[in-house]
Protein backbone atom coordinates (compact mmCIF):
# COMPACT_ATOMS: atom_id res chain seq x y z
CA UNK A 1 0.00 0.00 0.00
CA UNK A 2 2.82 2.41 0.84
CA UNK A 3 5.33 1.44 -1.82
CA UNK A 4 6.09 3.75 -4.71
CA UNK A 5 8.02 3.47 -7.96
CA UNK A 6 10.37 6.34 -8.77
CA UNK A 7 12.72 6.69 -11.69
CA UNK A 8 15.22 9.07 -13.15
CA UNK A 9 18.14 9.43 -15.53
CA UNK A 10 21.78 9.21 -14.63
CA UNK A 11 23.51 12.54 -14.03
CA UNK A 12 20.18 14.23 -13.35
CA UNK A 13 18.74 15.15 -9.97
CA UNK A 14 16.14 12.80 -8.55
CA UNK A 15 14.12 13.59 -5.44
CA UNK A 16 11.83 10.95 -3.95
CA UNK A 17 9.17 11.52 -1.30
CA UNK A 18 8.49 8.90 1.35
CA UNK A 19 5.24 7.20 0.31
CA UNK A 20 4.29 7.09 3.97
CA UNK A 21 3.78 10.78 4.56
CA UNK A 22 3.40 12.26 8.00
CA UNK A 23 3.06 15.72 9.42
CA UNK A 24 5.95 18.10 8.71
CA UNK A 25 7.10 17.94 12.33
CA UNK A 26 7.63 14.15 12.21
CA UNK A 27 11.14 12.80 11.95
CA UNK A 28 11.74 10.52 8.96
CA UNK A 29 14.66 8.09 8.80
CA UNK A 30 15.83 6.58 5.52
CA UNK A 31 17.64 3.26 4.99
CA UNK A 32 18.99 1.15 2.17
CA UNK A 33 16.59 -1.77 2.38
CA UNK A 34 19.13 -4.43 1.40
CA UNK A 35 21.78 -3.46 3.92
CA UNK A 36 19.58 -1.67 6.50
CA UNK A 37 22.29 0.99 6.44
CA UNK A 38 21.13 4.46 7.40
CA UNK A 39 21.22 7.15 4.73
CA UNK A 40 23.06 10.26 5.91
CA UNK A 41 21.35 13.60 6.35
CA UNK A 42 24.46 15.67 5.65
CA UNK A 43 24.06 17.61 2.41
CA UNK A 44 27.67 17.07 1.41
CA UNK A 45 26.75 13.51 0.42
CA UNK A 46 25.62 12.83 -3.13
CA UNK A 47 22.69 10.82 -1.77
CA UNK A 48 21.18 12.22 1.41
CA UNK A 49 17.92 12.28 3.36
CA UNK A 50 16.11 15.51 4.08
CA UNK A 51 12.99 14.82 6.13
CA UNK A 52 10.38 13.18 3.93
CA UNK A 53 12.62 13.57 0.90
CA UNK A 54 15.46 11.40 -0.37
CA UNK A 55 17.76 13.29 -2.71
CA UNK A 56 20.09 11.95 -5.42
CA UNK A 57 22.27 14.86 -6.55
CA UNK A 58 22.97 13.66 -9.14
CA UNK A 59 21.68 10.11 -9.58
CA UNK A 60 23.76 7.16 -10.72
CA UNK A 61 22.61 3.85 -12.21
CA UNK A 62 24.07 2.08 -9.17
CA UNK A 63 21.61 3.96 -6.92
CA UNK A 64 18.81 1.72 -8.18
CA UNK A 65 17.17 -0.30 -5.45
CA UNK A 66 14.59 -0.23 -2.69
CA UNK A 67 14.81 2.40 0.02
CA UNK A 68 12.96 2.24 3.34
CA UNK A 69 11.60 5.33 5.04
CA UNK A 70 10.39 5.20 8.63
CA UNK A 71 8.07 7.98 9.76
CA UNK A 72 8.43 8.52 13.50
CA UNK A 73 4.78 9.26 14.08
CA UNK A 74 3.08 8.97 17.45
CA UNK A 75 2.13 5.45 18.59
CA UNK A 76 3.75 3.69 15.64
CA UNK A 77 6.81 4.02 13.47
CA UNK A 78 5.22 3.80 10.04
CA UNK A 79 7.16 2.27 7.17
CA UNK A 80 7.19 3.13 3.48
CA UNK A 81 9.22 1.85 0.55
CA UNK A 82 10.61 3.72 -2.43
CA UNK A 83 11.56 1.54 -5.38
CA UNK A 84 14.10 3.65 -7.26
CA UNK A 85 15.40 2.90 -10.76
CA UNK A 86 18.02 5.04 -12.45
CA UNK A 87 18.40 4.59 -16.21
CA UNK A 88 21.19 5.41 -18.60
CA UNK A 89 20.50 8.37 -20.89
CA UNK A 90 19.08 7.39 -24.28
CA UNK A 91 21.18 8.35 -27.28
CA UNK A 92 18.18 8.57 -29.62
CA UNK A 93 15.04 10.67 -29.31
CA UNK A 94 12.60 7.96 -28.28
CA UNK A 95 11.55 8.03 -24.65
CA UNK A 96 10.93 4.43 -23.53
CA UNK A 97 7.68 3.55 -21.78
CA UNK A 98 9.42 2.94 -18.46
CA UNK A 99 10.46 6.61 -18.30
CA UNK A 100 6.94 7.87 -18.97
CA UNK A 101 4.78 9.49 -16.34
CA UNK A 102 0.99 9.19 -16.46
CA UNK A 103 -0.75 10.19 -19.67
CA UNK A 104 -2.85 13.34 -19.53
CA UNK A 105 -5.75 14.29 -21.77
CA UNK A 106 -6.61 17.70 -23.06
CA UNK A 107 -9.32 19.35 -25.07
CA UNK A 108 -10.00 22.65 -26.77
CA UNK A 109 -11.07 24.14 -23.44
CA UNK A 110 -8.45 22.59 -21.18
CA UNK A 111 -4.98 21.96 -22.49
CA UNK A 112 -2.69 22.09 -19.46
CA UNK A 113 0.20 19.65 -19.29
CA UNK A 114 1.73 19.58 -15.83
CA UNK A 115 5.41 18.85 -15.46
CA UNK A 116 5.53 15.62 -13.40
CA UNK A 117 7.23 15.60 -9.94
CA UNK A 118 8.35 19.24 -10.28
CA UNK A 119 6.83 20.16 -6.91
CA UNK A 120 9.54 18.14 -5.18
CA UNK A 121 12.30 20.32 -6.59
CA UNK A 122 13.70 23.78 -5.94
CA UNK A 123 13.34 25.22 -9.41
CA UNK A 124 12.88 28.60 -10.99
CA UNK A 125 10.88 29.51 -14.09
CA UNK A 126 10.82 29.23 -16.98
CA UNK A 127 10.43 25.58 -17.77
CA UNK A 128 11.64 24.30 -21.11
CA UNK A 129 9.22 22.10 -23.04
CA UNK A 130 9.85 19.67 -25.87
CA UNK A 131 7.53 17.58 -28.02
CA UNK A 132 9.04 14.44 -29.50
CA UNK A 133 12.45 15.96 -28.66
CA UNK A 134 11.82 19.20 -30.54
CA UNK A 135 11.80 22.46 -28.56
CA UNK A 136 8.33 23.97 -28.67
CA UNK A 137 8.17 27.29 -30.45
CA UNK A 138 5.35 29.54 -31.48
CA UNK A 139 2.67 31.61 -29.84
CA UNK A 140 0.37 28.60 -29.32
CA UNK A 141 2.68 27.27 -26.62
CA UNK A 142 2.90 29.03 -23.27
CA UNK A 143 5.04 27.79 -20.38
CA UNK A 144 3.21 28.94 -17.28
CA UNK A 145 4.46 28.10 -13.79
CA UNK A 146 4.73 24.29 -13.64
CA UNK A 147 2.63 23.55 -16.71
CA UNK A 148 2.41 24.04 -20.46
CA UNK A 149 -0.67 25.59 -22.04
CA UNK A 150 -1.48 24.85 -25.68
CA UNK A 151 -3.87 27.24 -27.41
CA UNK A 152 -6.40 25.94 -29.96
CA UNK A 153 -5.60 22.30 -29.32
CA UNK A 154 -5.76 20.01 -32.35
CA UNK A 155 -5.47 16.25 -32.64
CA UNK A 156 -1.96 16.74 -34.04
CA UNK A 157 -0.92 18.10 -30.64
CA UNK A 158 -1.03 14.60 -29.21
CA UNK A 159 2.39 13.17 -28.44
CA UNK A 160 5.13 12.91 -25.84
CA UNK A 161 5.97 16.12 -23.99
CA UNK A 162 9.15 16.57 -21.98
CA UNK A 163 9.70 19.29 -19.45
CA UNK A 164 13.22 20.27 -18.49
CA UNK A 165 14.19 22.38 -15.51
CA UNK A 166 17.06 23.11 -13.15
CA UNK A 167 17.04 22.04 -9.49
CA UNK A 168 19.15 24.20 -7.21
CA UNK A 169 20.63 22.79 -4.01
CA UNK A 170 22.97 24.97 -1.99
CA UNK A 171 24.08 26.91 -5.04
CA UNK A 172 24.69 23.83 -7.20
CA UNK A 173 22.50 23.27 -10.27
CA UNK A 174 21.22 19.90 -11.47
CA UNK A 175 19.19 19.17 -14.59
CA UNK A 176 15.89 17.28 -14.42
CA UNK A 177 13.72 16.02 -17.28
CA UNK A 178 10.32 14.34 -17.14
CA UNK A 179 8.15 13.05 -19.99
CA UNK A 180 4.48 12.27 -20.29
CA UNK A 181 2.07 11.55 -23.13
CA UNK A 182 -0.65 13.98 -24.06
CA UNK A 183 -3.83 12.88 -25.80
CA UNK A 184 -6.53 15.08 -27.27
CA UNK A 185 -10.12 14.20 -26.55
CA UNK A 186 -13.38 15.60 -27.78
CA UNK A 187 -15.20 17.88 -25.43
CA UNK A 188 -18.35 16.37 -24.02
CA UNK A 189 -20.60 16.48 -27.08
CA UNK A 190 -24.26 17.26 -27.60
CA UNK A 191 -26.63 17.03 -30.52
CA UNK A 192 -29.30 19.40 -31.69
CA UNK A 193 -31.88 19.69 -34.48
CA UNK A 194 -29.95 19.96 -37.79
CA UNK A 195 -29.03 23.44 -38.92
CA UNK A 196 -28.55 23.79 -42.70
CA UNK A 197 -25.91 26.39 -43.45
CA UNK A 198 -26.19 26.07 -47.24
CA UNK A 199 -28.13 26.34 -49.38
CA UNK A 200 -30.52 28.97 -48.11
CA UNK A 201 -34.18 27.99 -48.12
CA UNK A 202 -35.75 28.44 -51.61
CA UNK A 203 -32.44 29.58 -53.03
CA UNK A 204 -32.25 30.15 -56.81
CA UNK A 205 -28.95 28.94 -58.26
CA UNK A 206 -27.89 30.33 -61.62
CA UNK A 207 -26.32 27.81 -64.00
CA UNK A 208 -25.08 27.81 -67.62
CA UNK A 209 -26.58 25.30 -70.05
CA UNK A 210 -23.95 22.81 -71.28
CA UNK A 211 -21.62 23.52 -68.36
CA UNK A 212 -21.11 21.61 -65.12
CA UNK A 213 -22.72 22.82 -61.86
CA UNK A 214 -22.13 21.97 -58.20
CA UNK A 215 -24.61 22.36 -55.33
CA UNK A 216 -23.36 21.97 -51.75
CA UNK A 217 -25.59 20.82 -48.93
CA UNK A 218 -23.95 21.73 -45.61
CA UNK A 219 -25.44 21.15 -42.15
CA UNK A 220 -24.35 21.09 -38.51
CA UNK A 221 -25.67 18.70 -35.86
CA UNK A 222 -24.19 19.64 -32.52
CA UNK A 223 -20.80 19.35 -30.83
CA UNK A 224 -18.48 16.39 -30.60
CA UNK A 225 -18.92 12.97 -32.14
CA UNK A 226 -22.47 12.48 -33.42
CA UNK A 227 -24.19 9.12 -33.07
CA UNK A 228 -26.33 9.59 -36.17
CA UNK A 229 -26.12 12.43 -38.68
CA UNK A 230 -26.46 12.59 -42.43
CA UNK A 231 -26.84 15.05 -45.29
CA UNK A 232 -28.15 14.08 -48.74
CA UNK A 233 -29.77 15.41 -51.89
CA UNK A 234 -33.12 14.50 -53.39
CA UNK A 235 -34.50 15.24 -56.86
CA UNK A 236 -38.23 15.84 -56.99
CA UNK A 237 -38.52 14.00 -53.66
CA UNK A 238 -36.56 10.99 -54.94
CA UNK A 239 -33.17 9.68 -53.84
CA UNK A 240 -30.42 10.50 -56.33
CA UNK A 241 -29.61 6.81 -56.84
CA UNK A 242 -33.26 6.07 -57.61
CA UNK A 243 -33.75 9.05 -59.94
CA UNK A 244 -31.74 7.34 -62.67
CA UNK A 245 -29.95 10.30 -64.26
CA UNK A 246 -26.24 9.38 -64.54
CA UNK A 247 -25.29 13.02 -65.19
CA UNK A 248 -26.40 13.93 -61.69
CA UNK A 249 -24.39 12.39 -58.82
CA UNK A 250 -23.75 13.26 -55.19
CA UNK A 251 -20.45 12.83 -53.42
CA UNK A 252 -19.62 13.29 -49.79
CA UNK A 253 -17.56 16.27 -48.90
CA UNK A 254 -15.15 16.45 -45.98
CA UNK A 255 -16.49 16.13 -42.42
CA UNK A 256 -16.02 19.56 -40.97
CA UNK A 257 -15.49 20.88 -37.50
CA UNK A 258 -15.82 24.62 -37.64
CA UNK A 259 -13.96 27.01 -35.34
CA UNK A 260 -17.02 27.17 -33.08
CA UNK A 261 -16.56 23.45 -32.48
CA UNK A 262 -19.76 22.30 -34.20
CA UNK A 263 -19.83 18.94 -35.98
CA UNK A 264 -20.89 19.55 -39.60
CA UNK A 265 -21.23 17.51 -42.80
CA UNK A 266 -21.17 18.42 -46.51
CA UNK A 267 -22.70 16.69 -49.49
CA UNK A 268 -21.94 17.98 -53.01
CA UNK A 269 -24.38 17.44 -55.88
CA UNK A 270 -22.57 17.41 -59.23
CA UNK A 271 -24.56 18.06 -62.41
CA UNK A 272 -22.60 17.35 -65.57
CA UNK A 273 -23.53 19.10 -68.86
CA UNK A 274 -26.52 21.04 -67.49
CA UNK A 275 -29.60 20.61 -69.69
CA UNK A 276 -32.78 22.63 -70.08
CA UNK A 277 -34.89 19.99 -68.33
CA UNK A 278 -32.64 20.24 -65.19
CA UNK A 279 -34.14 23.69 -64.59
CA UNK A 280 -37.57 22.11 -64.06
CA UNK A 281 -36.43 19.86 -61.19
CA UNK A 282 -36.72 20.54 -57.45
CA UNK A 283 -33.44 20.03 -55.60
CA UNK A 284 -33.81 19.26 -51.89
CA UNK A 285 -30.93 19.41 -49.40
CA UNK A 286 -31.83 17.11 -46.48
CA UNK A 287 -30.13 17.06 -43.07
CA UNK A 288 -31.23 14.49 -40.51
CA UNK A 289 -30.26 13.16 -37.11
CA UNK A 290 -32.01 11.70 -34.06
CA UNK A 291 -33.81 15.00 -33.50
CA UNK A 292 -35.43 15.01 -36.93
CA UNK A 293 -35.12 16.15 -40.52
CA UNK A 294 -34.67 19.58 -42.04
CA UNK A 295 -35.11 20.33 -45.77
CA UNK A 296 -33.95 23.29 -47.87
CA UNK A 297 -35.13 23.52 -51.49
CA UNK A 298 -33.08 24.91 -54.38
CA UNK A 299 -34.15 25.63 -57.97
CA UNK A 300 -31.91 26.25 -60.96
CA UNK A 301 -32.25 29.19 -63.31
CA UNK A 302 -30.52 30.00 -66.57
CA UNK A 303 -27.69 32.48 -66.27
CA UNK A 304 -28.21 35.45 -68.59
Amino acid sequence: KFSKQSWGLENEALIVRCPRQGKPSYTVDWYYSQTNKSIPTQERNRVFASGQLLKFLPAEVADSGIYTCIVRSPTFNRTGYANVTIYKKQSDCNVPDYLMYSTVSGSEKNSKIYCPTIDLYNWTAPLEWFKNCQALQGSRYRAHKSFLVIDNVMTEDAGDYTCKFIHNENGANYSVTATRSFTVKDEQGFSLFPVIGAPAQNEIKEVEIGKNANLTCSACFGKGTQFLAAVLWQLNGTKITDFGEPRIQQEEGQNQSFSNGLACLDMVLRIADVKEEDLLLQYDCLALNLHGLRRHTVRLSRKN
Epitope: G22, P74, T75
Partner: antibody
Amino acid sequence: EVQLVESGGGLVQPGGSLRLSCAASGFTFSTYDMHWVRQTTGKGLEWVSAIDLAGDTYYPGSVKGRFTISREDAKNSLYLQMNSLRAGDTAVYYCARGGDGYNYDYYGIDVWGQGTTVTVSS
Amino acid sequence: DIVMTQSPLSLPVTPGEPASISCRSSQSLLHSDGYHYLDWYLQKPGQSPQLLIYLGSNRASGVPDRFSGSGSGTDFTLNISRVEAEDVGVYYCMQALQTLTFGGGTKVEIK
Protein backbone atom coordinates in the same frame (compact mmCIF):
# COMPACT_ATOMS: atom_id res chain seq x y z
CA GLU B 1 -23.83 5.69 16.05
CA VAL B 2 -20.13 4.79 16.29
CA GLN B 3 -19.90 1.22 17.51
CA LEU B 4 -17.56 -1.76 17.89
CA VAL B 5 -18.91 -5.25 18.57
CA GLU B 6 -16.58 -8.14 19.42
CA SER B 7 -17.34 -11.84 19.01
CA GLY B 8 -15.56 -15.19 18.92
CA GLY B 9 -14.55 -15.57 22.57
CA GLY B 10 -14.93 -18.85 24.40
CA LEU B 11 -13.24 -21.68 26.25
CA VAL B 12 -10.15 -23.19 24.66
CA GLN B 13 -7.48 -25.63 25.83
CA PRO B 14 -3.86 -24.54 26.30
CA GLY B 15 -2.04 -24.73 22.98
CA GLY B 16 -5.31 -24.21 21.12
CA SER B 17 -6.46 -21.45 18.80
CA LEU B 18 -9.25 -18.92 18.67
CA ARG B 19 -10.24 -16.17 16.26
CA LEU B 20 -11.83 -13.00 17.54
CA SER B 21 -13.82 -10.65 15.31
CA CYS B 22 -14.80 -7.03 15.69
CA ALA B 23 -17.53 -5.44 13.59
CA ALA B 24 -17.24 -1.67 13.20
CA SER B 25 -20.00 0.73 12.22
CA GLY B 26 -20.75 4.45 12.16
CA PHE B 27 -17.32 5.64 10.99
CA THR B 28 -14.86 5.33 8.10
CA PHE B 29 -13.18 2.19 9.38
CA SER B 30 -10.47 2.03 6.70
CA THR B 31 -8.72 5.24 7.80
CA TYR B 32 -8.29 4.36 11.46
CA ASP B 33 -5.62 2.52 13.40
CA MET B 34 -7.29 -0.31 15.30
CA HIS B 35 -6.23 -2.05 18.54
CA TRP B 36 -6.91 -5.09 20.64
CA VAL B 37 -6.59 -4.52 24.40
CA ARG B 38 -7.17 -7.19 27.03
CA GLN B 39 -8.01 -7.19 30.72
CA THR B 40 -7.39 -10.12 33.01
CA THR B 41 -9.89 -10.65 35.82
CA GLY B 42 -9.43 -8.03 38.51
CA LYS B 43 -6.31 -6.73 36.77
CA GLY B 44 -5.37 -3.80 34.61
CA LEU B 45 -5.44 -3.17 30.88
CA GLU B 46 -2.80 -4.60 28.54
CA TRP B 47 -2.31 -3.65 24.89
CA VAL B 48 -2.28 -6.79 22.72
CA SER B 49 -1.89 -5.69 19.10
CA ALA B 50 -2.59 -2.98 16.56
CA ILE B 51 -2.95 -2.56 12.82
CA ASP B 52 -2.71 0.67 10.86
CA LEU B 53 -4.51 1.72 7.71
CA ALA B 54 -1.75 0.26 5.53
CA GLY B 55 -2.15 -3.14 7.16
CA ASP B 56 1.15 -2.89 9.03
CA THR B 57 0.91 -4.78 12.32
CA TYR B 58 2.33 -4.17 15.80
CA TYR B 59 2.62 -6.49 18.83
CA PRO B 60 4.14 -6.50 22.32
CA GLY B 61 6.71 -9.21 23.02
CA SER B 62 4.23 -11.23 25.09
CA VAL B 63 2.12 -12.22 22.07
CA LYS B 64 4.50 -11.76 19.14
CA GLY B 65 4.61 -14.85 16.95
CA ARG B 66 1.43 -16.28 18.50
CA PHE B 67 -1.19 -13.63 17.72
CA THR B 68 -2.00 -12.17 14.29
CA ILE B 69 -4.11 -9.06 13.82
CA SER B 70 -5.77 -8.38 10.46
CA ARG B 71 -8.44 -6.18 8.96
CA GLU B 72 -10.96 -6.40 6.14
CA ASP B 73 -11.86 -2.84 5.27
CA ALA B 74 -14.55 -3.86 2.77
CA LYS B 75 -16.38 -5.59 5.61
CA ASN B 76 -15.51 -3.01 8.30
CA SER B 77 -14.03 -5.86 10.30
CA LEU B 78 -11.03 -6.38 12.57
CA TYR B 79 -9.72 -9.82 13.53
CA LEU B 80 -7.35 -11.36 16.07
CA GLN B 81 -6.08 -14.87 15.35
CA MET B 82 -4.73 -16.33 18.60
CA ASN B 83 -2.58 -19.45 18.40
CA SER B 84 -0.59 -21.41 21.00
CA LEU B 85 -2.83 -20.03 23.72
CA ARG B 86 -1.70 -20.10 27.35
CA ALA B 87 -3.52 -19.79 30.65
CA GLY B 88 -2.07 -16.29 30.96
CA ASP B 89 -4.01 -15.24 27.86
CA THR B 90 -7.30 -15.66 29.74
CA ALA B 91 -8.93 -12.22 29.68
CA VAL B 92 -11.68 -10.02 28.33
CA TYR B 93 -10.54 -8.83 24.89
CA TYR B 94 -11.59 -5.37 23.76
CA CYS B 95 -11.53 -4.03 20.22
CA ALA B 96 -10.71 -0.30 20.24
CA ARG B 97 -10.38 2.54 17.75
CA GLY B 98 -7.12 4.49 17.67
CA GLY B 99 -6.08 7.58 15.76
CA ASP B 100 -6.92 8.59 12.22
CA GLY B 101 -3.95 7.05 10.45
CA TYR B 102 -4.67 8.94 7.26
CA ASN B 103 -4.55 12.47 8.64
CA TYR B 104 -2.43 11.54 11.67
CA ASP B 105 -5.08 12.99 13.95
CA TYR B 106 -5.13 11.49 17.44
CA TYR B 107 -8.09 11.88 19.78
CA GLY B 108 -7.29 9.07 22.17
CA ILE B 109 -8.58 5.51 22.10
CA ASP B 110 -12.05 6.94 21.85
CA VAL B 111 -14.26 3.97 20.93
CA TRP B 112 -14.26 0.62 22.77
CA GLY B 113 -16.29 -2.51 22.22
CA GLN B 114 -18.14 -4.32 25.01
CA GLY B 115 -15.46 -7.02 25.14
CA THR B 116 -15.44 -10.77 24.52
CA THR B 117 -14.20 -13.28 27.09
CA VAL B 118 -11.45 -15.78 26.28
CA THR B 119 -10.78 -18.57 28.78
CA VAL B 120 -7.76 -20.82 28.32
CA SER B 121 -8.09 -23.85 30.54
CA SER B 122 -7.80 -27.61 30.43
CA ASP C 1 9.17 -0.09 26.45
CA ILE C 2 7.71 2.87 28.25
CA VAL C 3 6.58 2.03 31.80
CA MET C 4 3.64 3.91 33.34
CA THR C 5 3.33 4.26 37.11
CA GLN C 6 0.14 5.49 38.74
CA SER C 7 -0.54 6.65 42.27
CA PRO C 8 -2.34 6.19 44.50
CA LEU C 9 -3.52 2.62 44.01
CA SER C 10 -6.78 3.41 45.78
CA LEU C 11 -8.46 6.76 46.40
CA PRO C 12 -11.43 7.08 48.77
CA VAL C 13 -13.29 10.29 47.98
CA THR C 14 -16.08 12.42 49.39
CA PRO C 15 -18.72 13.63 46.92
CA GLY C 16 -18.31 17.35 46.23
CA GLU C 17 -14.62 17.26 47.20
CA PRO C 18 -11.73 17.50 44.72
CA ALA C 19 -9.52 14.54 43.83
CA SER C 20 -6.34 14.05 41.86
CA ILE C 21 -4.47 11.08 40.44
CA SER C 22 -0.81 11.12 39.45
CA CYS C 23 0.86 9.32 36.55
CA ARG C 24 4.56 9.09 35.78
CA SER C 25 6.21 7.73 32.64
CA SER C 26 9.67 6.20 32.33
CA GLN C 27 10.50 8.64 29.53
CA SER C 28 9.16 11.90 28.15
CA LEU C 29 5.87 11.59 26.29
CA LEU C 30 6.50 14.74 24.24
CA HIS C 31 6.51 14.04 20.50
CA SER C 32 8.22 16.20 17.86
CA ASP C 33 4.76 17.50 16.90
CA GLY C 34 4.59 19.31 20.26
CA TYR C 35 1.94 17.11 21.90
CA HIS C 36 2.19 14.92 24.96
CA TYR C 37 0.76 11.48 24.12
CA LEU C 38 -0.85 10.80 27.48
CA ASP C 39 -4.52 9.86 27.92
CA TRP C 40 -6.79 9.20 30.88
CA TYR C 41 -9.52 6.53 30.92
CA LEU C 42 -12.25 5.60 33.36
CA GLN C 43 -13.59 2.08 33.66
CA LYS C 44 -16.84 2.04 35.58
CA PRO C 45 -17.86 -1.25 37.28
CA GLY C 46 -18.99 -3.81 34.68
CA GLN C 47 -18.30 -1.49 31.73
CA SER C 48 -15.68 -1.00 29.04
CA PRO C 49 -13.07 1.74 29.50
CA GLN C 50 -14.10 5.21 28.34
CA LEU C 51 -11.89 8.07 27.25
CA LEU C 52 -11.73 11.13 29.50
CA ILE C 53 -8.66 13.13 28.48
CA TYR C 54 -6.38 12.85 25.42
CA LEU C 55 -3.05 14.45 24.58
CA GLY C 56 -2.47 15.37 28.20
CA SER C 57 -5.13 18.02 28.64
CA ASN C 58 -7.89 17.74 26.01
CA ARG C 59 -11.29 16.70 27.30
CA ALA C 60 -13.01 14.06 25.17
CA SER C 61 -16.46 14.72 23.74
CA GLY C 62 -19.21 14.50 26.35
CA VAL C 63 -16.86 14.50 29.33
CA PRO C 64 -17.97 16.87 32.13
CA ASP C 65 -15.76 19.90 32.67
CA ARG C 66 -15.04 18.85 36.27
CA PHE C 67 -12.41 16.56 34.73
CA SER C 68 -9.12 18.16 33.68
CA GLY C 69 -5.67 16.92 32.77
CA SER C 70 -2.33 18.61 33.20
CA GLY C 71 1.39 17.90 33.19
CA SER C 72 4.30 17.62 30.79
CA GLY C 73 7.38 15.54 30.08
CA THR C 74 7.06 12.54 32.40
CA ASP C 75 4.66 13.80 35.10
CA PHE C 76 0.91 14.08 34.59
CA THR C 77 -2.15 14.63 36.76
CA LEU C 78 -5.87 14.00 36.40
CA ASN C 79 -7.98 16.38 38.46
CA ILE C 80 -11.63 16.06 39.42
CA SER C 81 -12.80 19.42 40.75
CA ARG C 82 -15.90 18.06 42.58
CA VAL C 83 -16.31 14.31 42.72
CA GLU C 84 -19.76 12.91 42.02
CA ALA C 85 -21.07 9.48 42.89
CA GLU C 86 -21.06 8.44 39.20
CA ASP C 87 -17.30 9.04 39.02
CA VAL C 88 -16.44 5.81 40.87
CA GLY C 89 -14.42 3.22 39.02
CA VAL C 90 -10.83 2.51 38.01
CA TYR C 91 -8.87 5.33 36.35
CA TYR C 92 -6.02 4.48 33.99
CA CYS C 93 -3.39 6.66 32.41
CA MET C 94 -2.05 5.45 29.06
CA GLN C 95 0.85 6.54 26.91
CA ALA C 96 0.44 6.46 23.12
CA LEU C 97 3.86 7.77 22.14
CA GLN C 98 5.29 4.32 21.37
CA THR C 99 2.52 1.75 20.90
CA LEU C 100 0.29 1.73 24.02
CA THR C 101 1.11 1.18 27.69
CA PHE C 102 -1.35 1.51 30.55
CA GLY C 103 -0.71 2.48 34.13
CA GLY C 104 -1.73 0.01 36.86
CA GLY C 105 -4.94 1.88 37.61
CA THR C 106 -6.33 3.90 40.51
CA LYS C 107 -9.53 2.72 42.15
CA VAL C 108 -11.75 5.64 43.13
CA GLU C 109 -14.50 4.83 45.59
CA ILE C 110 -16.85 6.83 47.77
CA LYS C 111 -15.79 7.02 51.45
